[in-house]
C-alpha cells in the first residue's frame, strides 16, 4: 500500500524519499517515476540521479534537499489535478534485487477560491463588517464575508460615497466587486 501525501492546486507538492550513503559523497543512483514501481527501473521517469549528480529532470520536478546526503525527496512545482496519482522513488542499490522501492500516493485538492484584496486596512475601515479573516495554516487568507445588520440602502449609500475614492480603485484593481440589488 502507498503512503498518501496531499497538496493543493497551485502549491508545491513534497514527496519524501531518503537513503543513507555508504560514506559521505558515495552516492547511489535514484529514479523518480510517475506510476507504481515496476520490477526494474522507474516507469515514466521524471527525475534521475547518478553517482555524482542529478542527470535528468523534467520541468517542475526537482530535489530541494541535499541529495549528496541521501535526501532525494521530490518537489513538484505548481501542481495541477493532473499531478494526482502514484509516484515511485527507487534507490538503485548495486547488486541483484537490492533496490529500495517506495510508492507514494499524491492527492491534489482543488484550491480554495478567495479574492486577493489589496489595501486591506482601507477596505476594513470603510466596510468594517465586510472582511473576515480565516486561518489556513501559516498564511492567512482574507475572504469577503456576509453583511449582517446592514440593509441595501446603507450599502448603496456607502457604494456611492466610495465610487470616486481611491478605495474604489483599489477594489477594482483587486478584482473585488460590490453588487447592489
Amino acid at each position: 500500500s502507498e503512503v498518501e501525501y496531499r497538496a493543493e492546486v497551485g502549491q508545491n507538492a513534497y514527496l519524501p524519499c531518503f537513503y543513507t550513503p555508504a560514506a559521505p559523497g558515495n552516492l547511489v543512483p535514484v529514479c523518480w517515476g510517475k506510476g507504481a514501481c515496476p520490477v526494474f527501473e522507474c516507469g515514466n521517469v521524471v527525475l534521475r540521479t547518478d553517482e555524482r549528480d542529478v542527470n535528468y529532470w523534467t520541468s517542475r520536478y526537482w530535489l530541494n534537499g541535499d541529495f549528496r546526503k541521501g535526501d532525494v525527496s521530490l518537489t513538484i512545482e505548481n501542481v495541477t489535478l493532473a499531478d494526482s496519482g502514484i509516484y515511485c522513488c527507487r534507490i538503485q542499490i548495486p547488486g541483484i534485487m537490492n533496490d529500495e522501492k517506495f510508492n507514494l500516493k499524491l492527492v491534489i485538492k482543488p484550491a480554495k477560491v478567495t479574492p486577493a484584496p489589496t489595501r486591506q486596512r482601507d477596505f476594513t475601515a470603510a466596510f468594517p463588517r465586510m472582511l473576515t479573516t480565516r486561518g489556513h495554516g501559516p498564511a492567512e487568507t482574507q475572504t469577503l464575508g456576509s453583511l449582517p445588520d446592514i440593509n441595501l440602502t446603507q450599502i448603496s449609500t456607502l457604494a456611492n460615497e466610495l465610487r470616486d475614492s481611491r478605495l474604489a480603485n483599489d477594489l477594482r484593481d483587486s478584482g473585488a466587486t460590490i453588487r447592489i440589488g
Partner: antibody, heavy 123, light 106 residues
Framework: EVQLVESGGGLVQPGGSLRLSCAAS????????MSWVRQAPGKGPEWVSH????????KYADSVKGRFTISRDNAKNTLYLQMNTLKPEDTAVYYC????????????????WGQGTQVVVSS | SYELTQSPSVSVALKQTAKITCGGD??????AQWYQQKPGQAPVLVIY???RRPSGIPERFSGSNSGNTATLTISGAQAEDEADYYC?????????FGGGTHLTVL
C-alpha cells in the same frame, strides 16, 4: 497510524538470554529499515542495532557485537532482537524504531518509536 | 568512534528563542536528526535531514547544519517544549546520539 509494540523484556541473570519482539502496524513494514535503541536509567538513548528493509543487511553497536542478533519477519510484520550472554550493563528500556528509509547502508532517521520494554540483568 | 557533543542544559524564557547545538567533526557532511524526549516517554523525531520537520511537529522547530555544528532552534518556546533533546547522525557503520540537552522554559 504507525504502531510499534515491544514485548519480551524482563529480569534475567548475567549470562542469560532474552528475545525481544516488536509488532508493527500502520505502514508497509517490508519497505522500511528498523532499529533497536536502548536507554539506561537516567541516560540518553544508545543505538543498539539496525536491519535494512529486506533483512539482508544488519549493523551492531560495538558494545553488543557478537552477543545480539537482529532479525525481521516481513510476512509477520515483526522485528526481533535475540540477546545472549547478557551483562548488567545491558539493563535498559529497549525501544524498537522505524526508519524513514529502506536503510540498506544504515540508519537515516527514526520517525516512529514504540513505548519500550524493560530489560533488567541482575543476579 | 564518532562523538557528538551537546551542552547539558539550556534555559529560555517563555515565547523567546532557544538554540541547542550539537558539535561533531565535520557534522555538516552528515544528515543530522533531533529528538525530543519527555519524562517517561519514548523519543520523538522533531527534525531530520538537517532541517526537515515531520508532520505534526510545530513550525517553531527548525534546524540547520554546517561545518562542525548542527543547531536546533525553537522560535517562541512554549512550556510544553521543556524536555531533553538529542541529536543523532549515522557515521560509517553506527548511529550515534549526542549526550542530550535539557531545555528549561522559564
Amino acid at each position: 497510524e504507525v504502531q510499534l509494540v515491544e514485548s519480551g523484556g524482563g529480569l534475567v541473570q548475567p549470562g542469560g538470554s532474552l528475545r525481544l519482539s516488536c509488532a508493527a502496524s500502520g505502514f508497509t513494514f517490508s519497505s522500511y529499515a528498523m532499529s533497536w535503541v536502548r536507554q539506561a536509567p537516567g541516560k540518553g538513548p544508545e543505538w543498539v542495532s539496525h536491519i535494512n528493509s529486506g533483512g539482508g543487511n544488519t549493523k551492531y553497536a560495538d558494545s553488543v557485537k557478537g552477543r545480539f542478533t537482529i532479525s525481521r519477519d516481513n510476512a509477520k510484520n515483526t522485528l526481533y532482537l535475540q540477546m545472549n550472554t547478557l551483562k548488567p550493563e545491558d539493563t535498559a528500556v529497549y525501544y524498537c524504531a522505524k526508519d524513514v528509509s529502506g536503510g540498506y547502508y544504515g540508519t537515516y532517521a527514526l520517525d516512529a518509536w514504540g513505548q519500550g520494554t524493560q530489560v533488567v540483568v541482575s543476579s | 568512534s564518532y562523538e557528538l557533543t551537546q551542552s547539558p542544559s539550556v534555559s529560555v524564557a517563555l515565547k523567546q528563542t532557544a538554540k541547542i547545538t550539537c558539535g561533531g567533526d565535520n557534522i555538516g557532511s552528515k544528515s543530522a536528526q533531533w529528538y525530543q524526549q519527555k519524562p517517561g516517554q519514548a523519543p520523538v523525531l522533531v527534525i531530520y535531514a538537517d532541517s526537515r520537520r515531520p508532520s505534526g511537529i510545530p513550525e517553531r522547530f527548525s534546524g540547520s547544519n554546517s561545518g562542525n555544528t548542527a543547531t536546533l532552534t525553537i522560535s517562541g518556546a512554549q512550556a510544553e517544549d521543556e524536555a531533553d533533546y538529542y541529536c543523532q547522525v549515522w557515521d560509517s557503520s553506527a548511529a550515534v546520539f549526542g549526550g542530550g540537552t535539557h531545555l528549561t522554559v522559564l
